[in-house]
Structures are given as C-alpha cells and as structure tokens.
C-alpha cells in the first residue's frame, strides 16, 4: 500500500484517523517539513522571552530576550541578565571588575587587560573596567636611533576597529 | 594606511604657551588612539600624553600633569596638545601617534602604529 502520508506538504498532518488525508494543522501547531504524522506545538515566548516572529503552519514561533536580558544557547533557549559594562554576572548579580580585568560588553566575563610588555610593546593608554589597554610602540621604536617616519603602506588597510 | 601631519611647534619663552595640532587623514575610521611623544636630542622618546578616540579617555605623563591638556576633534580628525608654563626641559621635537587596534592587536600585512614626521618645540629660559 502506498504511504500517502509522503504527499502531506509543511503546514499539514497525514491524519491516521481520517484514511491518510491531510488535515491543516491546528492552531498554535506547525509542521516545517512534509510528510508529518502530528504536528508540533508552537513554542510561546513568555516571562523573559518576548515574540521575535509569530508561530505559523510551517514553522515555529521565535523568541527574544526582553530589555535588561539577552538570549543564550541554540534558538534563544536561555535568557540571561544584562550587565553594565565593566561588570561580570556572578550567582550574586553584577560585580564590577576587579583591578586588571575589563569587560567591553554587557554580557561575559571580565577579561585581564593585555599585557603589552608580553608582547614586545609600551601602553599607549591604560585600561579601565569598560576597556582593554592599548598598547603602542615598541620600545626599540622610542630608542634615539628610531626612524620617525610612518613604515611603509601595508598589504591591505587595517580592519575597522570600534572608535 | 593613516598619514598625520603635526604643526605648531616653535620657539618660546620659558612660562609661555603652546598648541600643537596633529591632522590625521586617511583610514582614520579605524584609529582607537593617538598619543604625544616627545625626544630630546640623545634621549628616548617619551609618552607625553594620550587619548581614547572614542570616549576621549586620556594618560598623561607625572611631568607634565596639571601644565598640558590633550584633546581631540573628531569631526576635523584632528588631536591637539595644548602646553602652558612650558619649561625648558619641555624642549623635543614632538611626535603625533595613531594606533588602530585595542591590545597589542597584529595581523599579518596590517600597520597599527602610525606617526607624524615631528615638530620642534623650544622653550629658551
């Protein structure tokens, strides 16, 4: 006998009960491919989820994060609270970050500044909670025999970096 | 690649006043920082001052707190080091920097540290 069921297009169930017709699926259902036997429930986006797109026949509901959260894991399946920049969540809440670290953004952990010494440089200007060091010149770039001028062009022009 | 060009640098008495400017063109989008070094014949070059293009954050070095004041227009792309109560051992040739990474960013083929050919600031006592 041939599974008629394979014919059912998204948006419809193969209704066992019905001899194998395809029925639309109910309200607050979907079914994004075809050939399903049921149809899934919608995923509703309440407490800390707010509806970033409605639910429809063929595919499933998708939810943001309210205001002061943001989303975590596959599909938004967590929120998480916002902190300020310069802060980390711990189980208590937001703590600042400790002397040293910085965090640039308002989700993560605090991160240690950039050691520019490890790295063969001077510190341009220091870092603060909200933001990392930059590091400048080399200090064989500052000696008194260093060339001032600017080196040559470079293979390609530097990424944007945020101002 | 970002070209600077600094000017107002001269010849003045111990006490008196000084703007430096440093014009910046070019990728200048991609500038976090720029900095005042400044060297003394036979000595290194020192961090005079810097800032933060974005927030206007700024460093200053212990001997010249309180005398010079670093600013910037970032509408002209334009960084300014204005001197008061120069000393004679304010005496360079001053330098303008521009760095285009936070960290000690590197990638191959990319320029971070840019500098201005200098302007000489002398301060007769």
């Known amino acids: 006998l041939q599974d008629l069921c394979s014919n059912c297009p998204a948006g419809t169930f193969c209704d066992n009960n019905r001899s194998q017709i395809c029925s639309p699926c109910p309200p607050n259902s979907f079914s994004s491919a075809g050939g399903q036997r049921t149809c899934d429930i919608c995923r509703q986006c309440k407490g800390v989820f707010k509806t970033r797109k409605e639910c429809s026949s063929t595919s499933n509901a998708e939810c943001d994060c309210i205001s002061g959260y943001h989303c975590l894991g596959a599909e938004c399946s967590m929120c998480e609270q916002d902190c300020k920049q310069g802060q980390e969540l711990t189980k208590k809440g937001c703590k600042d970050c400790c002397f040293g670290t910085f965090n640039d953004q308002k989700r993560g952990i605090c991160r240690p500044w950039t050691n520019c010494s490890l790295d063969g440089k001077s510190v341009l200007v220091n870092g603060t909670k909200e933001r990392d060091v930059v590091c400048g010149p080399s200090p064989a770039d500052l000696s008194p025999g260093a060339s001032s001028a600017t080196p040559p062009a470079p293979a390609r022009e530097p990424g944007h970096s945020p101002q | 690649q970002v070209q600077l060009q600094e000017s107002g640098g001269g010849l003045v008495q111990a006490g008196d006043s000084l703007r430096l400017s440093c014009a910046a063109s070019?990728?200048?989008?991609?500038?976090?920082?720029m900095g005042w070094y400044r060297q003394a014949p036979g000595k290194q070059r020192e961090l005079v001052a810097s800032i933060i293009t974005g927030d206007g954050d700024t460093n200053y070095a212990d001997s010249v707190k309180g005398r010079f004041t670093i600013s910037r227009d970032n509408a002209k792309n334009t960084m300014y080091l204005q001197m008061n109560s120069l000393k004679p051992e304010d005496t360079a040739v001053y330098y303008c920097?521009?760095?285009?990474?936070?960290?000690?960013?590197?990638?191959?083929?990319?320029?971070?540290?840019?500098w201005g050919q200098g302007t000489q600031v002398t301060v007769s006592s």
């Open positions: 070019g990728s200048t989008f991609s500038i976090v920082a």
């Open positions: 920097y521009a760095r285009t990474g936070y960290g000690s960013s590197w990638l191959m083929g990319h320029e971070y540290d840019y």
